[in-house]
């Protein structure tokens, strides 16, 4: 067995704000230290936590893909919100990619809903 310093973990990272855990958990925007003694602030714009937690690492902020726009930037308590660019949408069954919206409806159908970042245009049959 190798013997080392009892608690190198107790040494503070000076650039990060610290507080004490409550019942073993740290508040949103923080993660817990390795010795469970402190809550360490997540790094703004880099990582975050949304709930009370005992994370050893805050969660990494999402980076919007090309074809997406950043609607809300990442804070220490909220992940980045990305949205499909105009003219594209995200389908529920394939949320990882933005698909091009259809430019028009098939013959005999009429558009009742425009393209949004969450849905394609909607077409219904023309009433005769």
């Amino acid at each position: 067995i190798t013997r080392q310093s009892l608690d190198p973990q107790r040494r503070a990272a000076p650039q990060q704000k610290r507080s004490s855990p409550t019942e073993g958990l740290c508040p949103p925007g923080h993660h817990i230290s390795e010795d469970s003694r402190e809550c360490i602030s997540c790094k703004y714009g880099q990582d975050y936590s949304t709930h009370w937690n005992d994370f050893l690492f805050c969660l990494r902020c999402t980076k919007c893909d090309s074809g997406e726009v950043e609607v809300n930037s990442c804070t220490t308590t909220r992940n980045t919100v990305c949205q499909c660019e105009e003219g594209t949408f995200r389908e529920e069954d394939s949320p990882e990619i933005c698909r091009k919206c259809r430019t028009g409806c098939p013959r005999g159908m009429v558009k009742v809903k425009d393209c949004t970042p969450w849905s394609d245009i909607e077409c219904v049959h023309k009433e005769s």
Epitope: S5, E34, R37
Partner: antibody, heavy 117, light 108 residues
Framework: EVQLLESGGGLVQPGGSLRLSCAAS????????MSWVRQAPGKGLEWVSA????????YYADSVKGRFTISRDNSKNTLYLQMNSLRAEDTAVYYC??????????WGQGTLVTVSS | EIVLTQSPGTLSLSPGERATLSCRAS???????LAWYQQKPGQAPRLLIY???SRATGIPDRFSGSGSGTDFTLTISRLEPEDFAVYYC?????????FGQGTKVEIK
């Protein structure tokens, strides 16, 4: 004095399972994050998995995700690594270590896991 | 994933000489989360330095660590016979935790 003692290693066939244990003493076990680190024969060190003091948060290397499960029993001062679907490339000495991010300040002596048919 | 590249792979020196080991990260690492270890054949690694520059308890002052950002250095001011071993750097700044591939310090 801090002590970490691993057990449970041995020879296992590919696709098989093994459960490693690490008995800890000399510190307040339930307060500390713990890790497993492995070393393949003649190779360098590879972090495998980590767990928070309460056991509420767990982390894994991509190479073992979905196959290995880290857990702890704070009432027994024991850390575990359940290894399923073992592959030849999992052959290594597995070390139990105290800590995860700032440093691994204490290490066990290691237990050898050999995956071979 | 942060890749740590150690250089040189092998360092051939004589006792009494100075050893300078480098650890370069593929992206910036918080100094609080950079450590160095020594490992001898058949033994578990031993913590030397944590927080990039703080010596662990019982580590002789001939061992020192320095650096920030992406470049870190372990220096052994005067090599003793027991210092010939493999040295690893490790980062815990980002998940997953990663180690360098190691530098072997051997007797010339």
């Amino acid at each position: 004095e801090v002590q970490l003692l691993e057990s449970g290693g041995g020879l296992v066939q590919p696709g098989g399972s093994l459960r490693l244990s690490c008995a800890a003493s000399g510190f307040t076990f339930s307060s500390y994050a713990m890790s497993w680190v492995r070393q393949a024969p003649g190779k360098g060190l590879e972090w495998v998995s980590a767990i928070s003091g309460s056991g509420g948060s767990t982390y894994y290397a991509d190479s073992v995700k979905g196959r290995f499960t880290i857990s702890r029993d704070n009432s027994k001062n024991t850390l575990y690594l359940q290894m399923n679907s073992l592959r030849a490339e999992d052959t290594a000495v597995y070390y139990c270590a105290k800590g995860v991010r700032i440093s691994f300040d204490y290490w066990g002596q290691g237990t050898l896991v050999t995956v071979s048919s | 994933e942060i890749v740590l590249t150690q250089s040189p792979g092998t360092l051939s020196l004589s006792p009494g000489e100075r050893a300078t080991l480098s650890c370069r990260a593929s992206q910036s690492v918080s100094s609080s989360y950079l450590a160095w270890y020594q490992q001898k054949p058949g033994q578990a690694p031993r913590l030397l330095i944590y927080g990039a520059s703080s010596r662990a308890t019982g580590i002789p002052d001939r061992f020192s660590g320095s650096g920030s950002g992406t470049d870190f250095t372990l220096t052994i001011s005067r090599l003793e016979p027991e210092d010939f071993a493999v040295y690893y750097c490790q980062q815990g700044s980002n998940q997953p935790v990663t180690f360098g591939q190691g530098t072997k310090v051997e007797i010339k």
